[in-house]
Interface confidence: low
């Protein structure tokens, strides 16, 4: 009679994380009598996965009823596979011995490869805001995938970016891998509504690639442009001066009116109007009582935007043409700022 052979028909098995792996093994004979054991790895450091004779192996079930006398199918199922289960599994026949069973013959081994999905990509931008025409860096990270092969792409809105660097770690063999990519993006004034997208494609993904996004609204600062204009006279001694603050983002803005260098009023942008590109406009106005001034007045609109150094615009108000009212101290009336305008 031919000597017993241990046959592992599958050279390799590929399983997704969380699923059950079936490792097939059959013997060609019932003789010699003795148990089957499954090991991961070979040599002295091998790990016992299943012992037919004894032990508790909660994740392992046998495909056949090993208690039947004529059974020659020693296939097993390992449940809830994780990347840590990857390796080569050997089905080993032992011969009954005293006091210990003796290893008789091993199968050729089945390599178990585990596929694990990458985590959702997380995109993070710079800690501080930057202004248009500056280049900022975004990072994208995804973890826990296997096998190592993965594709990462960057997009700004619908356009693929090319200025990025990607690393997959570790370089050598591992149960799972991580990807880290840094992309450089040049900001434009129109980027308030823009998105930066990191797209990860992996063999485990059964739909579209995974995407992580970052809104450039959290990264960009668009500084305002200022325009100070004198409106027609409202009353005989009053001049209305407006300061148009245009195309700024984010909304955080404080405006101060100065008359000949002295603070007249400070206010915070509240009722702003939004432009199509996501930037804001705001208008503040000041009623100047020209009768309170003997000389020409230098009116300055000073704006501090998003904690940045103040920018200002001045307007010279000619008062010589207006009659002077003696005894009037009021240089400006603080009523009626923040008129709502749509540009």
């Amino acid at each position: 009679e031919e000597e017993l052979q241990v046959i592992q028909p599958d050279k390799s098995v590929l399983v997704a994380a969380g699923e059950t792996a079936t490792l097939r093994c059959t013997a060609t004979s019932l003789i010699p009598v003795g148990p089957i054991q499954w090991f991961r790895g070979a040599g002295p450091g091998r790990e016992l996965i299943y012992n037919q004779k004894e032990g508790h192996f909660p994740r392992v079930t046998t495909v056949s009823d090993l208690t039947k006398r004529n059974n020659m199918d020693f296939s097993i199922r390992i449940g809830n596979i994780t990347p840590a289960d990857a390796g080569t599994y050997y089905c080993v026949k032992f011969r009954k011995g005293s006091p210990d069973d003796v290893e008789f013959k091993s199968g050729a081994g089945t390599e178990l490869s585990v596929r694990a999905k990458p985590s959702a990509p997380v995109v993070s931008g710079p800690a501080a805001r930057a202004t248009p025409q500056h280049t900022v860096s975004f990072t994208c990270e995804s973890h826990g995938f296997s096998p190592r092969d993965i594709t990462l792409k960057w997009f700004k809105n619908g356009n693929e970016l090319s200025d990025f660097q990607t690393n997959v770690d570790p370089v050598g063999e591992s149960v799972s891998y991580s990807i880290h990519s840094t992309a450089k993006v040049v900001l434009t004034r129109e980027d308030v509504h823009s998105q930066v997208i990191c797209e990860v494609a992996h063999v485990t993904l059964q739909g579209d690639p995974l995407r992580g996004t970052a809104n450039l609204s959290e990264t960009i600062r668009v500084p305002p442009t200022l325009e100070v204009t004198q409106q027609p006279v409202r009353a005989e001694n009053q001049v209305n001066v407006t300061c148009q603050v245009r195309k700024f983002y984010p909304q955080r803005l404080q405006l101060t009116w100065l008359e000949n260098g002295n603070v007249s009023r400070t206010e915070t942008a509240s009722t702003v109007t939004e432009n199509k590109d996501g930037t804001y406009n705001w208008m503040s106005w000041l009623l100047v009582n020209v009768s309170a001034h003997r000389d020409d007045v230098k009116l300055t609109c000073q704006v501090e935007h998003d904690g940045q150094p103040a920018v200002s615009k001045s307007h010279d108000l000619k008062v010589s043409a207006h009659p002077k009212e003696q005894g009037s101290n009021t240089a400006a009336e603080n009523t009626g700022s923040n008129e709502r305008n749509i540009y």
Epitope: N157, A201, V203, T204, L205, Q206, G207, D208, P209
Partner: antibody, heavy 123, light 107 residues
Framework: QIQLVQSGSELKKPGASVKVSCKAS????????MNWVRQAPGQGLEWMGF????????TYAQGFKGRFVFSLDTSVSTAYLQISSLKAEDTAVYYC????????????????WGQGTLVTVSS | DIQMTQSPSRLGASVGDRVTITCRAS??????LAWYQQKPGKAPKSLIY???YRYIGVPSRFSGSGSGTDFTLTISSLQPEDFATYFC????????TFDQGTKLEIK
């Protein structure tokens, strides 16, 4: 560069069979599913189904079960479409098209197309 | 099956025009929508996937937008080589379905 090159035009009689090939180059065929799309003369595009190029498992759209068979020979990086018991209404251009996704991404958006194979069924 | 309806079915335009083609799905397809261009006697060419993403090599004058059921393909400044038939395709649900196409013709 990535290319899908299909076999040439075929003229067949009703009842006959035809086998259209689609050879992939520039990438590993087993990494991307291969779809088949039909376009009858003057008509739009009709998805016939796809083959999972890693497992070899085909998936057929409703109207293409039975006479249509998708197959694969990975050793020559080629996908095949076989149509048996040809009918006049099978006259069309048949395209193979690769999906963007990897091999276990079932169908999807097609990034590369073959040039098309005209199959004419006429007595 | 998800029906894809494109409008208009024929569209006359001139070089330099801004052209918008719309595509409507009979049910929500998320952003699983692609656009293709086909010239007579040629295979379709892939333009856009996931509703907004251009394939590499597709000119920036082509842009896609929309999600859910309503999508648009915009050509910002029509070039002579853009006269062709344009198809949209959903790949959210089996079977994958195309619309009947919009033929873009010289006015």
């Amino acid at each position: 560069q990535i290319q899908l090159v299909q076999s040439g035009s075929e003229l067949k009689k009703p009842g006959a069979s035809v086998k259209v090939s689609c050879k992939a180059s520039g990438y590993s065929i087993t990494n991307y599913a291969m779809n088949w799309v039909r376009q009858a003369p003057g008509q739009g595009l009709e998805w016939m189904g796809f083959i999972n190029t890693y497992t070899g498992e085909p998936t057929y759209a409703q109207g293409f079960k039975g006479r249509f068979v998708f197959s694969l020979d990975t050793s020559v990086s080629t996908a095949y479409l076989q149509i048996s018991s040809l009918k006049a209404e099978d006259t069309a251009v048949y395209y193979c098209a690769r999906t963007r996704g990897y091999y276990d991404f079932d169908g999807g958006a097609f990034d590369y197309w073959g040039q098309g194979t005209l199959v004419t069924v006429s007595s | 099956d998800i029906q894809m309806t494109q409008s208009p079915s024929r569209l006359g335009a001139s070089v330099g025009d801004r052209v918008t083609i719309t595509c409507r799905a009979s049910q929500n397809v998320g952003t699983h929508l692609a656009w293709y261009q086909q010239k007579p006697g040629k295979a379709p060419k892939s333009l856009i996937y996931s509703a907004i993403y251009r394939y590499i090599g597709v000119p920036s004058r082509f842009s896609g937008s929309g999600s859910g059921t309503d999508f648009t393909l915009t050509i910002s400044s029509l070039q002579p080589e853009d006269f062709a038939t344009y198809f949209c395709q959903q790949y959210n649900t089996y079977p994958l379905t195309f619309d009947q196409g919009t033929k873009l013709e010289i006015k």
